[in-house]
């Protein structure tokens, strides 16, 4: 079917558009172009004579319209006359006629628009604000903006006048903003310029900074004072009713008690012509003495001595308040507090309890802290250690042992060897050792202020020969799939090294196995049943090698899920029922049964005489392993047939 | 093939009227105006009017406003001009006729007599 | 309303001769001028359209020109069956007939 198609369908003035045809038929004489929705000889653009090629003038012709050899029609410079529809008129060879009609129309290129106002300075909560798009434009559709947004929903907002007209009712200060108008039209869309609409607004009541309102003696009183206005409010200050000064602060250096009283800041705004006041009272106090912290026992010791700090100096009607580690008391039995407050005590110190340590005295204004005390806190010594940890040693090396024991005053230590005193020194030096140098060496630290001592033995072998070494474990029954073991091999000899075996085998790799601590120690993650192996290691140096004896790992595991042997299910009555129930579990589990969920007997085996039909039913197992924690359980169900009902039946254990 | 079909003659009495038909074929009936001329015995062609059969819109030579009526029949594809009033001054041949841009087709004219 | 006027109500010619018969419109008309041969007894006959196009099957010896108000529709080497009456008309505001140009022999 023949048609039209105009491109663009919407024309902007000026410009051009494309009538395009479509399905043209064959064969044709000649075609015409109307304006209009039908052939009119008074309104013809333009025809085209194929044979010839020439284009004929109609009445209706511009000079403004090109006809192409495909029949469609190029109309430049378009003018807003030019809206509405086209008919083409072709004409075939047999004269048999067609006609195909097409519109398009045209929309002027629109201007900017600019925003009118009926009130530049409306006055907030009072007066109406009436904008208006500019200029007035036919078929043109208005829009406006609120910083960049489009309108919000508000009653207070009416669009009118074809949306040309925005109305703001009862303005308020929130509607100081940008405000753009847009016209748009198919063709064009065009923005005004912002205007920012000015709402004279206040002043709001005034706010005066800052808050406190008291104060000590010989500080500076500065009040500001500010009140949400448009334009910016004009300030004037009173105390005790007594006009001071217009602006928005007010000074006064080094303030006595005297200065007390109400002070009363006032906002006017000269265009709304409206005034607001706020009144604070101010109170000065006299100054307070700094307080400081008294202690009855300024070297306690550990476990022993209690301490009383009593914050200084003693005021009636006064808060007193303590910090420790610059946090407030924490709630502890050993920590007392005197019914004034103004004495902390600490019962039985530790080392932990040095501070340090503040109080504070609170008056109207604020509090006053002292300066922090510390507690020299009398400890140890504790258990001295002795490092390195080896015990074994190869002749002809340097021994070198160190001792240190917490303590507070530090320690003073003294070595012994088998017994006999040695020297008064924190280390130990004895140089190219022999066998003879074999013994228990002990190391004491004494706290010579609170007298105590402590000592720690040591026994140091020296010798060509590495010893049989052994197995420590750190968990003598772990539970599969749940704990990990870590074997050491016992003792630490320097210049040695370690190995493990595993069933004869050495090691085998595995993402469960790790070595550490230079191979002496061995752990097992999420051990399993398989882990139940003898673990041996070995010791060697450049002199000899030692194995320790196996240690098998016991794994606890299980209960798995039981099997209930024999596995038939049918039975003929007056057979024996013999069930015995099997579970894989370390230790072995405790076993029970329940026939149709009746509990029954404890023991692995469930044996019932000559059944019956009535023995039908569901025949539970249930394992327990104390051990581990775990249960499990099996369900069987039994049919017992009446005799000779069903051949092939099981006769029974 | 485009035929239009007329009466050949008509006679009337002087103050009565007539309604002349022109039987429209070989073409869309309704996409084409028709036109209608009168020619007096040795005179010229005088543009009548013209009347559209898709909506009946019509265009009157402003001489035959009130004298001649013109309206379609589009189930019978006919065009009709009613002349009303008549007297010696409307005796002439009257032809239909759709004249276009390389489309022009002529009816044979109806001769109307006006007589008593 | 357009008048066009045709001058010469008859012109007088021979077989083989040239003849041009003219027609003026009352204002500018464009091209928008059709011309139209009318033998006795036989409706009128379309020669020309846009002033100077001649419709298919019509024998070259016709030939329109002009524009705008003077058009002039010229028979060259004139034929025995060219004796005929000839009518201009404008198609550019509604339909109007010049009153025609009998051409016959000398």
């Known amino acids: 079917k023949l048609t039209i198609e105009s491109t663009p369908f919407n024309v902007a003035e000026g410009k051009e558009v494309l009538l395009l045809v479509h399905n043209l038929p064959q064969h044709l004489f000649g075609y015409s172009w109307y304006k209009g929705e039908r052939v009119d000889g008074n309104r013809q653009i333009i025809g085209y004579v194929i044979g010839t090629q020439q284009a004929t003038p109609g009445p209706a012709y511009s000079g403004r319209e090109i006809i192409y050899p495909n029949a469609s029609l190029l109309i430049q410079n378009i003018i807003q006359n030019d809206t509405g529809f086209y008919t083409l008129h072709v004409i075939k060879s047999d004269l048999v006629n067609e006609e195909a009609t097409g519109q398009f129309r045209v929309y002027p290129e629109l201007p900017k628009p600019s925003i009118s106002s009926n009130n530049s300075k409306p006055v907030e909560d009072k007066d109406a604000v009436a904008f208006t798009c500019e200029p007035e434009t036919q078929d043109a559709t208005y829009l406006w903006w609120v910083n960049n947004q489009s309108l919000p929903v508000s009653p207070r907002l009416q669009l009118s006048n074809g949306n040309r007209t925005l109305t703001l009712f009862n303005v308020t200060r929130n509607d100081t903003a940008s405000y753009k108008c847009e016209t748009q039209n198919p063709v064009s869309a065009r923005r005004s310029d912002s205007v920012i609409l000015n709402v004279l607004y206040g002043p709001d009541a005034p706010t005066i900074s800052p808050l406190n309102t008291s104060y000590r003696s010989g500080e500076n009183l500065n009040l500001s004072c500010h009140a949400a206005s448009n334009p910016p409010a004009q300030y004037s200050w009173f105390v005790n009713g007594t006009f001071q000064q217009s602006t928005q602060e007010l000074f006064i250096p080094n303030i006595t008690v005297n200065n007390s009283g109400s002070y009363t800041c006032q906002a006017h705004n000269s265009d709304t012509g409206l005034n607001r006041t706020t009144v604070t009272t101010i109170t000065v106090y006299a100054e307070p003495p700094k307080p400081f912290i008294t202690s009855n026992n300024s070297n306690p010791v550990e476990d022993e001595d209690a301490v009383a700090l009593t914050c200084e100096p003693e005021i009636q009607n006064t808060t007193y308040l303590w910090w420790v580690n610059n946090q407030s008391l924490p709630v502890s039995p050993r920590l007392q507090l005197s019914n004034d407050n103004r004495t902390l005590t600490l019962l039985s110190v530790t080392r932990n309890d040095v501070g340090p340590y503040e109080c504070g005295i609170q008056n109207e204004l604020s509090v006053d802290h002292s300066d922090p005390v510390i507690l020299n806190v009398l400890y140890g010594p504790d258990d001295p250690t002795i490092s390195p940890s080896y015990t074994y040693y190869r002749p002809g090396v340097n021994l070198s042992l160190s001792c240190h024991a917490a303590s507070n005053p530090p320690a003073q230590y003294s070595w012994l060897i088998d017994g006999n005193i040695q020297q008064h020194t924190q280390e130990l030096f004895i140089s190219n050792i022999t066998e003879k140098n074999s013994g228990l060496y002990t190391c004491q630290a004494n706290n010579s202020a609170s007298g105590h001592s402590r000592t720690t033995v040591k026994t140091i072998t020296v010798s060509a020969e590495l010893p049989k070494p052994s197995i420590s474990s750190n968990n003598s029954k772990p539970v599969e799939d749940k704990d990990a073991v870590a074997f050491t091999c016992e003792p630490e000899a320097q210049n040695t090294t370690y190995l493990w075996w595993v069933n004869g085998q050495s090691l085998p790799v595995s993402p469960r196995l790790q070595l550490s601590n230079g191979n002496r120690t061995l752990t097992l993650f999420n051990v399993t049943r398989n882990d139940a192996r003898a673990y041996v290691c070995g010791i060697q140096n450049s002199v000899s090698a030692n194995r320790s004896d196996p240690v098998t790992l016991d794994v606890l595991y299980g209960p798995d899920t039981p099997i209930i042997s024999p596995p038939d299910s049918s039975y003929l009555s007056g057979a024996n029922l013999n069930l015995s129930c099997h579970s894989a579990s370390n230790p072995s589990p405790q076993y029970s049964w329940r026939i149709n969920g009746i509990p029954q007997q404890h023991t692995q085996v469930l044996f019932i005489a000559k059944i019956t039909p009535n023995n039908n039913g569901t025949y539970a197992c249930f394992v327990s392993n104390l051990a581990t924690g775990r249960n499990n359980s099996i369900v069987k169900s039994i049919t017992v047939s009446a005799s000779g009902t069903s051949p092939g039946l099981s006769a029974g254990a | 093939q485009v035929q239009l079909q007329q009466p050949g003659a008509e006679l009337v009495k002087p103050g009565a009227s007539v309604k002349v038909s022109c039987k429209a074929s070989?073409?869309?009936?309704?996409?084409?105006?028709m036109h209608w001329v009168k020619q007096r015995p040795g005179q010229g062609l005088e543009w009548i009017g013209r009347?559209?059969?898709?909506?009946?819109?019509?265009n009157y030579n402003q001489k035959f406003k009130g004298k001649a009526t013109l309206t379609v029949d589009k189930s019978s594809s006919t065009a009709y001009m009613q002349l009303s009033s008549l007297t010696s001054e409307d005796s002439a041949v009257y032809y239909c006729?759709?004249?276009?841009?390389?489309?022009?087709?002529w009816g044979q004219g109806t001769t109307l007599t006006v007589s008593s | 309303d357009i008048v066009m006027t045709q001058s010469q109500k008859f012109m007088s010619t021979s077989v083989g001769d040239r003849v041009s018969v003219t027609c003026k419109a009352s204002?500018?008309?464009?091209?928008?001028v059709a011309w139209y041969q009318q033998k006795p007894g036989q409706s009128p006959k379309a020669l020309i359209y846009?002033?100077?196009y001649r419709y298919s099957g019509v024998p070259d010896r016709f030939t329109g020109s002009g524009s705008g108000t003077d058009f002039t529709l010229t028979i060259s080497n004139v034929q025995s069956e060219d004796l005929a009456e000839y009518f201009c008309?404008?198609?550019?505001?509604?339909?109007?007939f010049g009153a025609g140009t009998k051409l016959e022999l000398k």
């Open positions: 006729a759709i004249v276009e841009w390389m489309f022009d087709y």
């Open positions: 070989g073409y869309t009936f309704t996409s084409y105006w």
């Open positions: 009347i559209h059969p898709s909506d009946s819109d019509t």
């Open positions: 204002q500018n008309v464009g091209t928008n």
């Open positions: 846009s002033a100077s």
């Open positions: 008309q404008q198609y550019y505001s509604y339909f109007t």
